[in-house]
Interface confidence: medium
């Protein structure tokens, strides 16, 4: 029955980019500007998303597909389909309710978004710290002292991973 009904329905012949216009004897009319239909057989066209304010147009609306937005410089997308724009911070910072704040000692963020994460604990893997961590970079772990045969390495064990003059917050 469904198959028979769809064959008799003139609207089923209307392709994407058009709508079945009841006011014009159900002929297929093109979607008007700023609207689209992504599937065939639709009785209305959907209004295109408008990228306003902090949103900017990444992909313009066509008669068969909606517009896509991203965020203006200094912001980044959050949520499905970039439903929100969140402020960027600098590397070494994270966004809080009071704005961008430096990462606490012992944490880092190497991106303009997201939260500060703890430095890797090299000793958990039986390794030593090869390069100290910073607010922007994780520590680099080196081979464990046992892996180094005497006199086979010129690596000097680094000082404790702490930035000079950077007190815990």
């Amino acid at each position: 029955f469904e198959r028979t009904r769809s064959l008799q329905d003139p609207c089923s012949n209307c392709p994407a980019g058009t709508f079945c216009d009841n006011n014009r004897n159900q002929i297929c009319s093109p979607c008007p500007p700023n609207s689209f239909s992504s599937a065939g057989g639709q009785r209305t066209c959907d209004i295109c998303r408008q990228c306003k304010g902090v949103f900017r147009t990444r992909k313009e609306c066509s008669s068969t597909s909606n517009a896509e937005c991203d965020c203006t410089p200094g912001f980044h997308c959050l949520g499905a389909g970039c439903s929100m724009c969140e402020q960027d911070c600098k590397q070494g910072q994270e966004l809080t309710k009071k704005g961008c704040k430096d990462c606490c000692f012992g944490t880092f963020n190497d991106q303009k978004r997201g939260i500060c994460r703890p430095w890797t604990n090299c000793s958990l893997d039986g390794k030593s710290v090869l390069v100290n961590g910073t607010k922007e970079r994780d520590v680099v772990c080196g081979p464990s002292p046992a892996d180094l045969s005497p006199g086979a390495s010129s690596v000097t064990p680094p000082a404790p991973a702490r930035e000079p003059g950077h007190s815990p917050q």
């Epitope: 008007p32 500007p33 992909k59 066509s62 008669s63 068969t64």
Partner: antibody, heavy 116, light 107 residues
Framework: QVQLQQPGAELVKPGASVKLSCKAS????????INWVKQRPGQALEWIGN????????NYNGNFKSKATLTVDRSSSTAYMHLSSLTSKDSAVYYC?????????WGQGTTLTVSS | DILLTQSPAILSVSPGERVSFSCRAS??????IHWYHQRTNGSPRLLIK???ESISGIPSRFSGSGSGTDFTLSINSVESEDFADYYC?????????FGSGTKLEIK
């Protein structure tokens, strides 16, 4: 930065046809409409039509439907407008412009002269 | 087709003055109007979109207002670089149409 590059001038004979080009750069070509606009000397702007390079959707001003054909070459990010059966009335500056509704970037325009 | 009527054809002002351009549509087009200026031998440049929305890089002295059939572009203090032709354009329905233009000249 966004740029639309057009040849400066074209000279063709009456009755002939011409294919005007508009090379886009600085953005994703398939994501934005390209419009074509005519301006005769001392006259107002006249919208010819537009094309969506992502799927070749086109819309035309009825006055130009038998005159202009819009196409794109995605591999070179270039939009084209083919004008046929040229007469002196087709002598004008032809601009390409990016935008679905408001036209935010424009080429420098191609001056088309139809003369024997 | 939607007809856009711009008036007057020519506006004469002195630098520093405030000036307003009018654009009237032949039918209700909501806020689907955009404003451009075009300097001599140059390409048009988008100034305002959707009647009142500002454009990045355009000086704040340019503003727009209106909805329905009557629209206005204003320059709150004209500078020498503003002397040019001004056009409105509608995107409510195809074909898009432009107004006949208003020439802003130095008094």
């Amino acid at each position: 930065q966004v740029q639309l590059q057009q040849p400066g001038a074209e000279l063709v004979k009456p009755g002939a046809s011409v294919k005007l080009s508009c090379k886009a750069s600085g953005y994703t070509f398939t994501n934005f409409w390209i419009n074509w606009v005519k301006q005769r000397p001392g006259q107002a702007l006249e919208w010819i039509g537009n094309i969506y390079p992502g799927n070749d959707n086109t819309n035309y001003n009825g006055n130009f439907k038998s005159k202009a054909t819009l196409t794109v070459d995605r591999s070179s990010s270039t939009a084209y407008m083919h004008l046929s059966s040229l007469t002196s009335k087709d002598s004008a500056v032809y601009y390409c412009a990016r935008g679905q509704l408001g036209l935010d970037y424009w080429g420098q325009g191609t001056t088309l002269t139809v003369s024997s | 087709d939607i007809l856009l009527t711009q008036s007057p054809a020519i506006l004469s002002v002195s630098p520093g003055e405030r000036v307003s351009f009018s654009c009237r549509a032949s039918q209700n087009i909501g806020t689907a109007i955009h404003w451009y200026h075009q300097r001599t031998n140059g390409s048009p440049r988008l100034l305002i979109k959707f009647a009142s929305e500002s454009i990045s890089g355009i000086p704040s002295r340019f503003s727009g207002s209106g909805s329905g059939t009557d629209f206005t572009l204003s320059i709150n203090s004209v500078e020498s670089e503003d002397f040019a032709d001004y056009y409105c354009q509608q995107s409510n329905s195809w074909p898009f149409t432009f107004g006949s233009g208003t020439k802003l000249e130095i008094k």
